[in-house]
């Protein structure tokens, strides 16, 4: 069976949108009006992994691009990157673990925990126009809560 996917956008809990910054980086900033068209549309795929009532394993690809968010060690630190893949082979049900995020739903907000690096989350800074990154703390200065907006195909 083919992997199930849906198109969506994500905003952090401060309502910052995610946009491309160069070919392999996302940044978070407040957008208004026509600028909203700049925001990244994700293809969220529902992949194999440990699932529970509030936790669902997903992969986050960029719609119509051969890029997926992935988590790797760089200089011994878990790091978020955009990784180029072969479109003939992706998305797939059994994604490599570096591509998998546990989508956790709490009080109508979403967290995206790295399956590869438990307790590390997709994060944004309080500051405007800063890169989206993988953070190892929840409830601190950095933002780990998101909302999801569905986008028609």
């Amino acid at each position: 069976a083919p992997v199930r996917s849906l198109n969506c956008t994500l905003r952090d809990s401060q309502q910052k949108s995610l946009v491309m910054s160069g070919p392999y980086e996302l940044k978070a900033l407040h957008l208004q009006g026509q600028d909203m068209e700049q925001q990244v549309v994700f293809s969220m795929s529902f992949v194999q992994g440990e699932e529970s009532n509030d936790k669902i394993p997903v992969a986050l690809g960029l719609k119509e691009k051969n890029l997926y968010l992935s988590c790797v060690l760089k200089d011994d630190k878990p790091t978020l990157q955009l990784e180029s893949v072969d479109p003939k082979n992706y998305p797939k049900k059994k994604m490599e673990k570096r591509f998998v995020f546990n989508k956790i739903e709490i009080n109508n907000k979403l967290e995206f925990e790295s399956a590869q690096f438990p307790n590390w989350y997709i994060s944004t800074s309080q500051a405007e126009n800063m890169p989206v990154f993988l953070g190892g703390t929840k409830g601190g200065q950095d933002i780990t809560d998101f909302t999801m907006q569905f986008v028609s195909s």
């Epitope: 069976a1 199930r4 849906l6 529902f46 699932e51 509030d54 669902i56 739903e105 999801m148």
Partner: nanobody, 123 residues
């Protein structure tokens, strides 16, 4: 043509049990995650349970966990829901859904569903 035919519903007293079945045809049953959703009178659809392709993973809504058991028999192209310790609030039409994927706690995607079978829990 995909067909899903549920059966096994009926009237049961609180604390009683029922076993629902869903006979599937028109697709390669064993390849797909399957599940059950329900609709209580005057309410919206509610996800109940899912079972992965190959049946090695099962998932349940909190409201039925420990009381309901989902299973499948790929040789018979049939999905089951064993419902024990039934309560009045379990009264609903139960639908079998093909390629069921949960998106959020109260949102899911599926390709096909059956016509449903009514379960009434009342004394």
């Amino acid at each position: 043509e995909v067909q899903l035919l549920e059966s096994g519903g009926g009237l049961v007293q609180p604390g009683g049990s029922l076993r629902l079945s869903c006979a599937a045809s028109g697709f390669t049953f064993e390849d797909y995650q399957m599940g059950w959703v329900r609709q209580a009178p005057g309410k919206g659809l509610e996800w109940v349970s899912s079972i992965s392709a190959m049946g090695n993973r099962t998932y349940y809504a909190d409201s039925v966990k420990g009381r309901f058991t989902i299973s499948r028999d790929d040789s018979k192209n049939t999905l089951y829901l064993q419902m024990n310790s039934l309560r009045a609030e379990d009264t609903a039409v139960y639908y079998c859904a093909e390629n069921l994927v949960r998106v959020l706690l109260n949102k899911w995607m599926f390709d096909y569903w059956g016509q449903g079978t009514l379960v009434t829990v009342s004394s």
